[in-house]
């Protein structure tokens, strides 16, 4: 017997799709060897139609895929737009030739079934409405009209013109005539459920002179759309349920054994397992909406359904749309930290991966907010101004070609705790969710700036020092001037660097920056930080006020400006942590209204197109001492 296993017989109808799963023994060789799907010919030769090596035959072009799931020891062959010509014998198998390990699969594709001439076939999806048309002769114009459903030999009345309605069709069935028509009546059945399927008979009149019509009603469960996504990537469920439910609450649920558990709905319900990584966005006034989930995990795989009902919960007989999500563990998206920890007054440096092939894409960082359907307003971007409330403490450092950019947030407060998203206007799969946890500081900060009340006088020399501990001895120290388009590195002087590392004196490790002479435009936020190559570490910020020599009052009270920076920062901004639940997420609708519209986020900053280059000191009056 072959160790490969799959469905022996697959049957479908023209125009449909099939997904054939083949199971193989879990060995390293099997996981990585070629997978194939071939058609058995009369001559015994099996002609390859598709393989995991990238081969795709002409007859399968644009309608088939083969996906390997090594973690499950399975591979799936999807074939769409079936025709009767696809009927035949096939093999799914493993190996460099089509004579290796295989399993025989018989595929039969039939024509869409036909019914007797007098039977009208109605095909509707669950939750929709069917209108059954019933014709009659003039002689029965004033006779009783009815619709019954065949159950074995009997035909049970569903509704009739005497206003009788079967209890199971109450509030769902109506019998009516249109305009002045004298030879046709109609029956509407709404909120269709699977048990409504079957053969119906319309009747006008009684006895042998009665006019009868047969109607075959097929109520279809939604065919799930198959979605294949990589681990840590994102998925968007596009839901279009039609105008008739435009004003009802919408939901996305995940099917389990007994029920469909709501993940998110427009009434504010959200599943905690998706905290910080899910977003529901209305698309238009016709009831279309989308749900975006980022940071996909293996356990996110499964069956999803979107629907509409005033309760925001799944309800039998209401329209639904379905998907089956597969999460492939062989992901191109690197594993990045999902929880970053900081302390009040301290800083965090968050590394955001992006598709290295898209180094010129615009980079963004947004804060997920849990109100209503969730949103994620952009806080900073390569061409977006830093949002109000984050001036002087937030910067994005792009590192072109490295496949990552860094976002630094300092002067942390407990209000900064929450979920943040890294995203670009390029490959929409590369969206990562970070949970920032800010705890109260329990010790002095590692980086300290003196003087703390920094007021410089125009025309004079002003020096500011940053004290760092010995643990930062080998790291690069820098000063930068913060502006809305980044933090521009300044020349600085490291006074601790002259000592040998063996005799590091904790008290004399200083990196200083001098403004000589001080100009009015030197006023603003300055950061002292440490980094190793492209890896940014801790930072601290100080506001430097600039005043005229003659005036006594500074432009801004530096004590107030620096208040945020005085709390003791963290010991280790990004201590390693286990992956923790990242919950509800929702983004700025302008970013997520459509996968293609993310570039519009840059429009916030039309007047400021400079990018925050962390390596530039241009335009600054800082100089080395």
């Amino acid at each position: 017997q072959s160790p490969i296993f799959g469905p022996q017989d697959v049957s479908s109808i023209e125009g449909n799709s099939v997904s054939i799963t083949c199971y193989y023994p879990d060995t390293s060789v099997n996981r990585h060897t070629r997978k194939y799907w071939c058609r058995q010919g009369a001559n015994g030769y099996c002609a390859t139609l598709i393989s995991s090596n990238g081969y795709l035959s002409k007859e399968y072009s644009g309608r088939a895929s083969l996906i390997n799931f090594p973690e499950n020891s399975t591979f799936v062959i999807n074939i769409a737009h079936l025709t009767q010509e696809d009927t035949g014998s096939y093999k799914c198998g493993l190996g460099t030739t089509n004579r290796g390990l295989f399993f025989d699969v018989s595929l039969e594709v039939s024509q869409v079934p036909e019914f007797p001439n007098d039977t009208h076939v109605y095909t509707k999806d669950i939750g929709r409405t069917v209108t059954i048309e019933c014709r009659f002769k003039e002689g029965n114009a004033h006779s009783k009209k009815s619709l019954c459903k065949k159950r074995g030999e009997a035909c049970e009345v569903v509704i009739d013109s005497t206003e009788y309605v079967d209890p199971s069709y109450k509030d769902r069935a109506i019998l009516f005539m249109k305009g002045t028509s004298r030879d046709i009546f109609y029956v509407n059945i709404s909120h269709l459920i699977p048990s409504d399927a079957g053969l119906y008979v319309c009747q006008a009149g009684e006895g042998p002179s009665a006019d009868k019509n047969n109607a075959d009603l097929q109520v279809l469960e939604p065919e799930p759309e198959l979605l294949y996504k990589d681990l840590r990537s994102s998925v968007t469920f596009e839901c279009d349920l039609g105008r008739e439910v435009a004003n009802d609450a919408k939901y996305l649920c995940r099917k389990n054994k007994e029920t469909c558990d709501v993940i998110i709905n427009t009434l504010g319900k959200r599943d905690p397992a998706f905290e910080g990584r899910i977003l529901l966005t209305p698309r238009d006034d016709n009831g279309r909406f989308s749900v975006l989930i980022t940071g996909l995990r293996k356990e996110d795989a499964g069956h999803y359904q979107c629907g509409a009902h005033s309760s925001g919960l799944p309800q039998e007989g209401w329209p639904v749309q379905a998907w089956q999500l597969f999460v492939n563990e062989e992901s191109t998206i690197p594993n990045s930290r999902s929880v970053v920890k900081g302390v009040t007054g301290g800083s965090v440096a968050i590394v955001c991966p992006y598709n290295p092939k898209e180094s010129s894409s615009l980079k963004y960082w947004c804060h997920w907010e849990a109100d209503e359907n969730g949103r994620c307003p952009v806080l900073v971007g390569t061409q977006a101004l830093v949002q109000e409330g984050y001036e002087g403490r937030l910067a994005l450092f792009d590192q072109p070609g490295s496949g990552a950019y860094t976002v630094i947030l300092n002067q942390l407060t407990t209000q900064d705790s929450g979920f943040y998203w890294c995203l670009t206007d390029g490959d929409s799969r590369w969206r990562t969710t970070i949970e920032l946890q800010v705890a109260e500081a329990t010790k002095k900060p590692d980086l300290e700036v003196t003087p703390q009340n920094a007021t410089a006088v125009i025309g004079e020399t002003f020096t500011i020092s940053c004290h760092y501990p010995c643990k930062f001895y080998s790291q690069e120290k820098y000063w930068c001037k913060w502006s809305n388009d980044g933090c521009h590195i300044l020349p600085s002087h490291d006074e601790g660097a002259r000592q040998s590392s063996v005799s590091c004196d904790q008290s004399s490790q200083i990196v200083s920056m001098t403004l000589n002479p001080v100009k009015k435009e030197d006023e603003g936020w300055y950061w002292c930080g440490v980094k190793e190559g492209q890896v940014y570490g801790e930072t601290t910020a100080i506001y430097v006020a600039v005043e005229e020599r003659t005036r006594g009052s500074p432009h801004i009270n530096p004590t107030d400006a620096n208040a945020r920076a005085k709390d003791a920062p963290e010991e280790e901004a990004m201590e390693s942590s286990v992956r923790e639940d990242e919950n509800k997420a929702n983004l700025d609708p302008r970013l997520f209204a459509d996968e293609r519209e993310i570039q519009n986020a840059g429009d916030q900053a039309q007047e400021n197109r400079a990018s925050g280059n962390a390596g530039s000191a241009g335009g600054q009056s800082g100089s080395s001492k």
């Epitope: 296993f5 469905p7 022996q8 017989d9 697959v10 049957s11 479908s12 109808i13 449909n16 799709s17 099939v18 997904s19 054939i20 799963t21 199971y23 799931f69 499950n72 399975t74 799936v76 459920i193 699977p194 048990s195 279809l220 469960e221 065919e223 799930p224 099917k255 389990n256 054994k257 007994e258 795989a301 499964g302 069956h303 039998e316 089956q324 597969f326």
Partner: nanobody, 130 residues
Framework: EVQLVESGGGLVQTGGSLRLSCAAS????????MGWFRQAPGKEREFVAA??????????YVGDSVQGRFTISRDAAGNTVYLQMNSVKPEDTAVYYC?????????????????????WGKGTLVTVSS
């Protein structure tokens, strides 16, 4: 509450045929997959056959030991599944259990694994005499 009721078991001679039925009932229970497993005294539960459907597409799976002899089918409504047993052998003697799934599972889940089935019947005994 979902119920699976097997019928059709009994005594049959070697080489003979038997047809087992399994009816699923329960308000709004609309199964997505149904299957048959069997258990002989002192042995583990063994996969016999399964049928899975999605819209107008049907997938049939058959266990190695019954390949070419047993076939699985279902009625048009999808709530009853049949196991046609032909050319039976003494080693086919076992209690035959019906299984059902209401939720479409990830298609990478192996139908041969009893743990991945949600609902089970009480079983029907098939005895093959030589």
């Amino acid at each position: 509450e979902v119920q699976l009721v097997e019928s059709g078991g009994g005594l049959v001679q070697t080489g003979g045929s038997l047809r087992l039925s399994c009816a699923a009932s329960g308000r709004t229970f609309s199964p997505y997959a149904m299957g048959w497993f069997r258990q002989a005294p002192g042995k583990e539960r063994e996969f016999v056959a399964a049928i899975r459907w999605s819209g107008a597409t049907t997938y049939k799976y058959v266990g190695d030991s019954v390949q070419g002899r047993f076939t699985i089918s279902r009625d048009a409504a999808g709530n009853t599944v049949y196991l046609q047993m032909n050319s039976v052998k003494p080693e086919d003697t076992a209690v035959y259990y019906c299984a059902a799934d209401r939720v479409p599972k990830d298609i990478s889940i192996d139908p041969r694994n009893p743990k991945d089935w949600d609902y089970w019947g009480k079983g029907t005994l098939v005895t093959v005499s030589s």
